[in-house]
């Protein structure tokens, strides 16, 4: 995308960032817990092999920054970055950023409520040092460390409700939703890729709405 | 495997001070916050105070306040607490607690009997 | 005032259900942990945060929350569970931390 321009193409999109292809399509060989992508993914298969190990080239962002994250909860930050590297369904929520490693980010994208609360159940007793996973760390070793006297403590003091984890850990990159999965109103993280891709729908019907919302806005600037 | 070791049994005068160390090992020590409680002889715990393991910030009981010091090294993984003017309602079993999450206390030293007697 | 209230001394029978509690204002606002203490051991983490379990910790231990007050249920009480337990608060004001009085339980049987 032109940097000094908003998305026009919402639909079947990859985002302008450090890993992504610029053209969604097939990739057969997609790894684990991305393989739900295979059909038409934004990631490739190294990179998918790449996000599911500790510490992987891709960030070099250590989940184990307070002793050893439980593996009920990484599968959810493995699931998390999956849908960030492959989805072509986030579209409606891409928006610019003026940063040295990518020029585009998602932002409140919706995501099911269901999706969220497991997430959040899942790992609300592994530890952290921080609410915010996008800035503040120490990375003087290249690896992300806990910035001096940031405490590790439980993900439920750092992160109370499922709303302060999901929203609040990528810097809005998530809101939650009320819908539930499968209502076609909300992204799910996870899926069974032998029914399709629910998110193609989700992202069809934000998009259509944006459409609307935008033609009527430009049809109030005119009057005004 | 986290453990938490403390210093041997002290006796003491009245009027003395102690000074109770507590080793931790198997994870990263200035990471977590140290809290030390004491339990006099068959009574209820007792919080005396924490320090932040990492920036060495301390919080201490009002109760103690002026009468504890707790401090720590952290190229020793060990932290400290020292507690003056002693008298005889400070014997008690002084123990050093890991924090995980405001006031959860998931490891405990074993417990150091500090005896003020004259 | 920055209290944690405990009754004193809870008996039950082998194998029915006991309800240990803790009142105080700070429980508004924060969780309650609850420990498990054996004569001449350090006390033992069962309960912490919303309703959280330590690895190792059987699940006939559960927490509840309720306004001002905090309950540890042990559903099932073993003869092993018989201790003292303590309650613990964070006090929001200066980030202290606050004791109950503990609770003596006896299991009968």
């Known amino acids: 995308a032109d940097p000094g321009q908003d998305r026009t193409d919402l639909l079947n999109v990859c985002m302008d960032a450090k890993h992504h292809k610029t053209k969604p399509g097939p990739e057969d060989k997609l790894h684990d817990q991305c393989s739900p992508w295979k059909k038409n993914a934004c990631c490739t298969a190294s990179t998918s092999q790449e996000l599911h190990k500790d510490t992987s080239r891709l960030y070099n962002f250590n989940w184990d920054h307070c002793g050893k994250m439980e593996p009920a909860c990484k599968r959810h930050f493995i699931q998390d970055t999956c849908l960030y590297e492959c989805s072509p369904n986030l579209g409606p929520w891409i928006q610019q950023v003026n940063q040295s490693w990518r020029k585009e980010r998602f932002l409140d994208v919706p995501l099911c409520k269901e999706d969220c609360q497991r997430w959040w159940e899942d790992c609300h007793t592994s530890h952290t040092c921080k609410s915010n996973w996008h800035r503040g760390w120490d990375w003087t070793s290249g690896v992300n460390k806990c910035p001096a006297g940031a405490l590790c403590r439980t993900f439920e003091s750092y992160f109370p409700t499922p709303a302060a984890l999901c929203e609040g850990l990528w810097s809005h990159s998530y809101k939650v939703s009320n819908y539930s999965r499968g209502s076609g109103r909300c992204i799910q993280m996870w899926f069974d890729s032998a029914q399709g891709n629910p998110n193609e729908e989700v992202a069809r019907f934000y998009a259509a709405a944006m459409h609307v919302n935008a033609g009527e806005m430009l049809h109030h600037h005119h009057h005004h | 495997e986290v453990q938490l070791v403390q210093s041997g049994a002290e006796v003491k005068k009245p009027g003395a001070s102690v000074k109770v160390s507590c080793k931790a090992s198997g994870y990263t020590f200035t990471s977590y916050a140290m809290h030390w409680v004491r339990q006099a002889p068959g009574q209820r715990l007792e919080w005396m105070g924490w320090?932040?393991?990492?920036?060495?910030?301390?919080k201490y009981s009002q109760k103690f306040q002026g009468r504890v010091t707790i401090t720590r090294d952290t190229s020793a993984s060990t932290a400290y607490m020292e507690l003056s003017s002693l008298r005889s309602e400070d014997t008690a079993v002084y123990y050093c607690?890991?924090?995980?999450?405001?006031?959860?206390?998931?490891?405990w030293g074993q417990g150091t009997l500090v005896t003020v007697s004259s | 005032s920055s209290e944690l209230t405990q009754d004193p001394a809870v008996s039950v029978a082998l194998g029915q259900t006991v309800r240990i509690t803790c009142q105080g204002d700070?429980?508004?606002?924060?969780?309650a942990n609850w420990y498990q203490q054996k004569p001449g051991q350090a006390p033992v983490l069962v309960i912490y945060g919303q309703n959280n379990r330590p690895s190792g910790i059987p699940d006939r231990f559960s927490g509840s929350s309720s306004g001002n007050t905090a309950s540890l249920t042990i559903t099932g009480a073993q003869a092993a569970d018989e201790a003292d337990y303590y309650c613990d608060s964070r006090v929001s004001t200066g980030n202290h931390v606050v004791f109950g009085g503990g609770t003596k339980l006896t299991v009968l049987g």
């Open positions: 700070s429980l508004r606002s924060n969780y």
């Open positions: 607690a890991r924090d995980i999450s405001y006031g959860s206390f998931d490891y």
């Open positions: 320090i932040n393991a990492g920036n060495g910030n301390t």
